[in-house]
């Protein structure tokens, strides 16, 4: 049975040019973690595999940067960044679990950050 | 470099037994997924089977589940396939290959030929 | 099982040309679809991994594209080591599958 959760930072914006971390969290299972892969709207962001580290879509080497962590960090934002990411857990033995996070990416320089982690 | 060298291959009646081999170079064996994979003559290619680094996940095609049986030795750096009751359909190039990330399957021996025939 | 469909089955084209390949899939597999190149007596050789990166060493007029279920290889402008034979395969659910490929003939 999958007893996991996952916490991410939810709802979060941020400024044109910019840079934002996207945190995901998985809670309350003994599940070992294998890989987590980062994913915008059907494309591939990044991979992190327990064995084999950190890798970044050709596409994305520019603009994405490993970490904290198993999370991501987007640099240089453009409006076109705005939209859903999914962070997909692969676990043994308990499977997948996937977080989501909405981010806006803002003209102005007004940008709230979500509540679950405070992004310095 | 990496390097995967694939043996085992040869002729077999129906109904009889072959193990493959897949001896790996060039990497850390222990830290990659691999596959077998096989293109029977003049034909496209077919996965057979799969497992995860640490054996701890297999899969199979359902053609050859209960049959052959995939497995690993990381300490040997060498993957096998164990093939039973054979059929002349199972006649075919058998390649294995490395899958990182377990997405894509970036290296590929360059196969062994297995032919059931009587 | 996702069934993987390729077209054309062959295609004939002269050096230089702009060549596009299509596979669809039975079912949404997001970006899970790589490309391979195999000629031959040869074992395949990856081109494109998930949708559209690039395989290190590929040359650069190969190019993949989509997500879902429909998804494109293009090759710029055809060399004549190019002439092969090309196979989709979508790595999204187990069991994985392949399209049934194709073959880039010399017109």
């Known amino acids: 049975m999958m007893t996991g959760t996952i916490e991410t930072t939810g709802n979060i914006s941020a400024e044109k040019g910019g840079s934002i971390i996207l945190q995901c969290h998985l809670s309350s299972t003994t599940a070992q973690v294998t890989q987590v892969n980062w994913e915008q709207q059907d494309q591939l962001l990044a991979i992190c595999n327990a064995d084999l580290g950190w890798h970044i879509s050709p596409s994305f080497k520019d603009r994405v940067a490993p970490g904290p962590g198993l999370g991501l960090t987007l640099q240089s934002l453009t409006v076109n960044d705005t939209g859903e990411y999914f962070c997909i857990y692969h676990t043994y033995p308990d499977g997948t679990y996937t977080g989501r996070i909405f981010l806006e990416v803002l003209e102005s320089s007004v940008a709230e950050h979500g509540a679950r982690f405070q992004i310095p | 470099e990496v390097q995967l060298l694939e043996s085992g291959g040869g002729l077999v009646q129906p109904g009889g037994s072959l193990r493959l081999s897949c001896a790996a170079s060039g990497f850390t064996f222990s830290s990659y997924s691999m596959s077998w994979v096989r293109q029977a003559p003049g034909k496209g290619l077919e996965w057979v089977a799969d497992?995860?680094?640490?054996?701890?996940?297999?899969g199979y095609a359902d053609s050859v589940k209960g049959r052959f049986t995939i497995s690993r030795d990381n300490s040997k750096n060498t993957l096998y396939l164990q093939m039973n009751s054979l059929r002349a359909e199972d006649t075919a190039v058998y390649y294995c290959?490395?899958?990182?990330?377990?997405?894509?399957?970036?290296?590929w021996g360059q196969g062994t030929l297995v032919t059931v025939s009587s | 099982d996702i069934q993987m469909t390729q077209s054309p089955s062959s295609l004939s084209a002269s050096v230089g040309d702009r060549v596009t390949i299509t596979c669809r899939a039975s079912?949404?597999?997001?970006?899970?679809l790589n490309w391979y190149q195999q000629k031959p007596g040869k074992a395949p050789k990856l081109l494109i991994y998930?949708?559209?990166s690039l395989q290190s060493g590929v040359p650069s007029r190969f190019s993949g594209s989509g997500s879902g279920t429909d998804f494109t290889l293009t090759i710029s402008s055809l060399q004549p080591e190019d002439f092969a034979t090309y196979y989709c395969q979508q790595s999204y659910s187990t069991p994985l599958t392949f399209g049934g490929g194709t073959k880039v003939e010399i017109k």
């Open positions: 497992i995860s680094s640490s054996a701890s996940t297999i």
């Open positions: 290959a490395r899958e990182p990330y377990d997405v894509w399957m970036d290296y």
């Open positions: 079912q949404s597999i997001s970006y899970y």
């Open positions: 998930a949708a559209s």
